[in-house]
């Protein structure tokens, strides 16, 4: 798994307009990140979740569907 700043496993705010950047706070990193939509090349990156792009780091980040965890939302959350 990637680290929490690059691939936060907790839900954060998603951009309303997929073409625009937005600010959001991830629970794990406790810092503000600037997000945009992910490049389409990442359409299969998040297994059970939605992809967003960390603009400053140029890296994808997954916002997992409920009941899933992991950098790519690839694991079932046994505690859910």
């Amino acid at each position: 798994d990637g680290n929490s700043t690059r691939s936060p496993e907790t839900n954060g705010l998603l951009c309303g307009d997929p073409e625009e950047n937005c600010a959001a706070t991830t629970t794990q990193s406790k810092r503000k990140g600037h997000f945009s939509r992910c490049p389409k090349q990442y359409k299969h990156y998040c297994i059970k979740g939605r992809c967003r792009f960390v603009v400053a780091e140029q890296t994808p980040s997954c916002v997992c569907d409920e009941g899933y965890i992991g950098a790519r939302c690839e694991r079932v959350d046994l505690f859910y």
């Epitope: 073409e19 490049p39 090349q41 990442y42 990156y45 140029q58």
Partner: antibody, heavy 120, light 107 residues
Framework: QVQLVQSGAEVKKPGSSVKVSCKAS????????ISWVRQAPGGLEWMGGI???????NYAQKFQGRVTITADESTSTAYMELSSLRSEDTAVYYC??????????????WGQGTLVTVSS | DIQMTQSPSSLSASVGDRVTITCRAS??????LNWYQQKPGKAPKLLIY???NLQSGVPSRFSGSGSGTDFTLTISSLQPEDFATYYC?????????FGQGTKVEIK
């Protein structure tokens, strides 16, 4: 400093195959995607690339079935094999490293290029 | 595939001139666009990534702007070493595609 060193020029017959190598030094080889880009008089053309996080190669539809891109982690070397060569495949072939671990973004390091000439 | 169209295909300019090259994508690519410079017999060199970010070591006279489908590379004051061919490249979707290039020549 990252360096990508490619194998030498090749002259091939139509219908044959060519395999070009790209040896990386000065960085962690399996941390970044490696792509192959060719340049003929028409301009630059992305052929495909290997993304470490996925482990498999992604190819441009145009070359699907004719190109194979592989990587040998033990020698920090990437390979591009193009089969069923035709005269239109005459070009300079570059390997290029992506600036990202996760996908193919900007190509921040390039090999010196390998001229492949296809002629009968 | 996403088509990238550059204009002009070539231009003549003098040292000190301000030069602008445009790149248009056939569909919106957000800001997932890079610019390269290439000199004869050499590999391309990354100038700008993510539409407007200057690559480390690249002179500040180079700048990029744009989002969506329309992008611009600007050289604020052309230097002798800037005479070259410039390419844009999108990385929104596979396959990665390049513009056809803009050759900047000496007037």
């Amino acid at each position: 400093q990252v360096q990508l060193v490619q194998s030498g020029a090749e002259v091939k017959k139509p219908g044959s195959s060519v395999k070009v190598s790209c040896k990386a030094s000065g960085g962690t080889f399996n941390d970044y995607a490696i792509s192959w880009v060719r340049q003929a008089p028409g301009g630059l053309e992305w052929m495909g690339g290997i993304i470490p996080i996925f482990g498999n190669a992604n190819y441009a539809q145009k070359f699907q079935g004719r190109v194979t891109i592989t990587a040998d982690e033990s020698t920090s070397t990437a390979y591009m094999e193009l089969s069923s060569l035709r005269s239109e495949d005459t070009a300079v072939y570059y390997c290029a490293r992506s600036s990202s671990t996760y996908g193919i973004h900007a190509f921040d390091y390039w090999g010196q290029g390998t001229l492949v000439t296809v002629s009968s | 595939d996403i088509q990238m169209t550059q204009s002009p295909s070539s231009l003549s300019a003098s040292v000190g001139d301000r030069v602008t090259i445009t790149c248009r994508a056939s569909q919106s690519i957000s800001n997932f666009l890079n610019w390269y410079q290439q000199k004869p017999g050499k590999a391309p060199k990354l100038l700008i990534y993510a539409a407007s970010n200057l690559q480390s070591g690249v002179p500040s006279r180079f700048s990029g702007s744009g989002s969506g489908t329309d992008f611009t590379l600007t050289i604020s004051s052309l230097q002798p070493e800037d005479f070259a061919t410039y390419y844009c490249q999108q990385y929104d979707d596979f396959p990665m595609t390049f513009g056809q290039g803009t050759k900047v020549e000496i007037k």
